[in-house]
């Protein structure tokens, strides 16, 4: 089978990824690969900002525009991706540059289904191999990266690198970050003027931009702060060993005085603002089951209380190449039955201290509409319907037939393509609706195909409550009530009057009200009344009555 297409038809050979901690990057900056630009066969052009240096492995599905669809993302902000053309075979760079906007909104963003895995993973505190986020939680402004094709990405004003590693054997979590921000908002490039007499810097200067990794021990529920310095520094009150400050309690501040023989007083005073415990947060799938075929909702839940200032906690999500600074995200207009990978992290004072990845498979979508080939009545009590099944997967059909206000529904085998309806009422209009359904997280019904027919005529039922009364010596008045079932298009009442075996009268009226005059006196007559619906006569109602001896 072909690779699984994304909602927009884009398929990736592997998830876009930037190593979170392993690759050396200049000056702890956020890494983004250049944009890949595809020229489309169909005269559309499309840009893809890939989070992988490996963007040449990105492929485009063959689905052309058939499967192209936009999707929305909602959280702090709502993002509607453009309707993206697909069907590309070349990777010719386009003129100009591509832009990618971060901070909860995206331009030209696409969400790719993950190829391969069926597993749902929810691993807080484990290494996330597929996300590096531009860390700018405090800036209210949107940072726009201007990405040149196959060149180093231009950096946002604030440059930072967040790394996270996990070792399954020691239950420690590691997170670090460095930030350099100039007053003008651009990245600082330090230059050193070479003096004739070398002098030692102060420790305060030397360790001004020291970074710290917080390692969390799930057993002791304590943190260790690892000081990221090249040499073995000394800490006041011997608070550190091998550049590590141990046994730090969550949400408590600790002050560390850092010195070294390569620098002079004053020492660097480092305030360690310890984050909350990792296990106090849980990444929760908040997708409504009814919408699980085309939406994904993810939300960080605080499952235990802590004393840290919640204002200092920021959340970040990355799904495909879309990044959101929200505690909860909602992705919409996704493809049913596709896997999507979202990476998320939580930062405390801009230091990442936990992360989680989720691979979520969207639910089965509603089946398409079956195509009715024909439906017709071939007899008074029968009808037949034939159809072609819908394109998408489904479990069964529901066939409903409605006459006037009565509705009957049947559950039909998914392999049926024809069905005979029995015991129908003659000369009655039936409206049929046929839909396929699938039982997934909820039952999803496909669109119904409709058709109608009118059953053939049949003999009407018998007239009833027939009366014969004498109005004079030689006259009779015959009345009856209409049949319960006319079963045909027309309405006519017939009266046949027989004396012995001889037909003496044959009358037809719109109503069952006959006045029979000039009969012979003292004669036995047989009165037969029946209804005719234009196609068939009904069973006659028969009464016997005699005229009397003439009174004059």
């Amino acid at each position: 089978q072909s690779p699984t297409p994304s909602p927009t038809g884009l398929t990736t050979a592997k998830m876009p990824s930037v190593p979170l901690s392993s690759d050396p990057l200049p000056t702890h900056t956020t890494a983004f690969s250049p944009a890949s630009t595809f020229e489309r066969e169909n005269d559309f052009s499309e840009t893809t900002t890939s989070l992988s240096p490996d963007n040449t492995s990105t492929q485009v599905s063959p689905d052309s525009l058939d499967n192209a669809s936009a999707f929305n993302t909602t959280g702090v902000s709502s993002v509607q991706t453009p309707h993206l053309p697909t069907h590309a075979d070349s990777q010719t760079p386009s003129a100009g540059t591509d832009t990618q906007t971060f901070s909860g909104s995206a331009a030209n963003a696409k969400l790719n289904p993950t190829p391969g895995s069926n597993a749902i993973s929810d691993v807080p505190g484990e290494r996330s191999t597929a996300s590096t986020f531009p860390t700018d939680p405090v800036s209210p402004l949107t940072t726009t990266l201007s990405l040149a094709h196959h060149s180093s990405a231009a950096l946002p004003a604030r440059t930072s690198n967040t790394t996270i590693t996990a070792n399954t054997s020691d239950a420690y979590l590691n997170a670090s970050e460095t930030t350099t921000l100039s007053p003008s908002g651009s990245a600082v490039i330090s230059t050193t003027t070479i003096a004739t007499t070398p002098s030692k810097p102060t420790c305060d200067e030397k360790y001004a931009n020291i970074t710290v990794d917080y390692l969390y021990n799930k057993e002791t529920k304590l943190f260790t702060a690892k000081l990221n310095v090249n040499e073995n520094v000394e800490c006041g009150n011997n608070t550190c060993t091998n550049n590590e400050v141990h046994n730090l309690t969550e949400c408590k501040n600790a002050s560390v005085s850092i010195s070294h023989n390569s620098c002079t007083a004053p020492d660097k005073t480092l305030i360690l603002d310890v984050p909350p415990g990792v296990e106090k947060f849980q990444l929760h799938d908040c997708t409504q089951v009814e919408k699980a075929d085309t939406t994904i909702c993810l939300k960080w839940k605080n499952i235990e209380t802590f004393t840290c200032d919640t204002q200092n906690i920021t959340y970040r999500f990355q799904c495909g190449n879309m990044i959101f600074d929200n505690k909860e995200i909602k992705l919409e207009n996704l493809e049913p039955e596709h896997e999507y990978k979202c990476d998320s992290e939580i930062l405390y004072n801009n230091h990442k201290f936990t992360n989680a990845s989720k691979i979520i498979k969207t639910d089965f979508g509603s089946p398409g509409e079956p195509q009715i080939i024909f439906c017709r009545s071939e007899a008074a009590h029968q009808g037949v319907i034939t159809w072609n099944p819908p394109q998408r997967s489904f479990h069964n059909f529901t066939l409903c037939y409605i006459k006037e206000t009565e509705k009957d529904c049947l559950n039909l085998d998914k392999n049926l393509i024809k069905y005979d309806l029995q015991n129908l009422k003659p000369y009655t209009k039936y409206v049929l609706s046929l839909h396929a359904y699938i039982i997934a997280k909820v039952q999803r019904n496909g669109s119904a195909a409709m058709c109608h027919f009118t059953t053939k005529s049949a003999p009407p039922s018998q007239v009833w409550n027939m009366t014969v009364s004498m109005t004079s010596d030689n006259s009779m008045h015959v009345k009856c009530r209409p049949p319960r079932d006319r079963n045909g298009p027309h309405e006519r009442y017939h009266l046949e009057v027989e004396a012995g075996n001889t037909l003496v009268r044959n009358e037809s009226h719109k109503n069952c009200d006959f006045r029979v005059k000039d009969l012979q006196y003292s004669t036995d007559y047989t009165f037969k009344a029946y209804f005719h619906n234009g196609d068939y006569p009904g069973e006659p109602f028969i009464l016997h009555h005699s005229t009397s001896y003439n009174s004059k």
Partner: antibody
């Protein structure tokens, strides 16, 4: 005796087009759903497309959707596969197959196959 | 899509022996499974449908079993003409998918 005979295969360049035909005999062609199945060299079978009795409904595998078109001519008892934007991965033997169809039921398996026609997509 | 995992890929046996081929579906497919035989220069032939129903003309030494996710094709008392490639196919849902095939060779 049910017979299905494919034709129209051969060598075509990437990006090119080709039309395959399948001549059917020995059964009432219009009473059956029909299909194309392919097999890349030294690989397994892959369903390509299916079509309803009169051609009003068509069904495609993901890898060919938007590029291939299945059609039929019931008067000529012939099934067709129009292949556009061909790629090297479309190189395969293409089989015409009849789907198991009764008056009331359709089952998506293949009760009769043709011997196949080879399509090579190469520059 | 429903993935069909067929095993073994190769199987060597002698005439008169019995062999079994396994086919596993990635999700339940009820009994919507067919088995086919493929020989060079011949049209593919359906052997079994609905998991265990022999197609008219299939010799009784062939049998199919299973439902849900696990299926098998058994050939008892192998005949020389049985040496071929065998494929399973699910038809529970579209896209229709096949197993990767089992080549049955003479030992």
């Amino acid at each position: 005796e049910v017979q299905l005979v494919e034709s129209g295969g051969g060598l075509v360049q990437p990006g090119g087009s080709m039309k395959l035909s399948c001549a059917a005999s020995g059964f009432t062609f219009s009473d059956y759903y029909m299909a194309w199945v392919r097999q890349a060299p030294k690989k397994g079978l892959e369903w390509v497309a299916s079509m309803s009795f009169a051609g009003s409904s068509t069904y495609y595998g993901d890898s060919v959707k938007g590029r291939f078109t299945i059609s039929r001519d019931n008067a000529k008892t012939t099934l067709y596969l129009q292949m556009n934007s061909l790629r090297s991965e479309d190189t395969a033997t293409y089989y015409c197959a009849r789907m198991y169809t009764t008056d009331y039921y359709l089952y998506w398996y293949f009760d009769f196959w043709g011997p196949g026609t080879m399509v090579t997509v190469s520059s | 899509d429903v993935q069909m995992t067929q095993s073994p890929s190769y199987l060597a046996a002698s005439p008169g022996e019995s062999v079994s081929i396994s086919c596993k579906a990635s999700k339940s497919i009820s009994n919507y499974l067919a088995w086919y035989q493929q020989k060079p220069g011949e049209a593919n032939k359906i052997l079994i449908y609905s998991g265990s129903t022999l197609q008219s003309g299939t010799p009784s030494r062939f049998s199919g079993s299973g439902s849900g996710t696990d299926f098998s094709l058994t050939i008892r008392n192998l005949e020389p003409e049985d040496f071929a490639v065998y494929y399973c196919q699910q038809y529970d849902e579209k896209p229709l998918t096949f197993g990767s095939g089992t080549k049955l060779e003479i030992k």
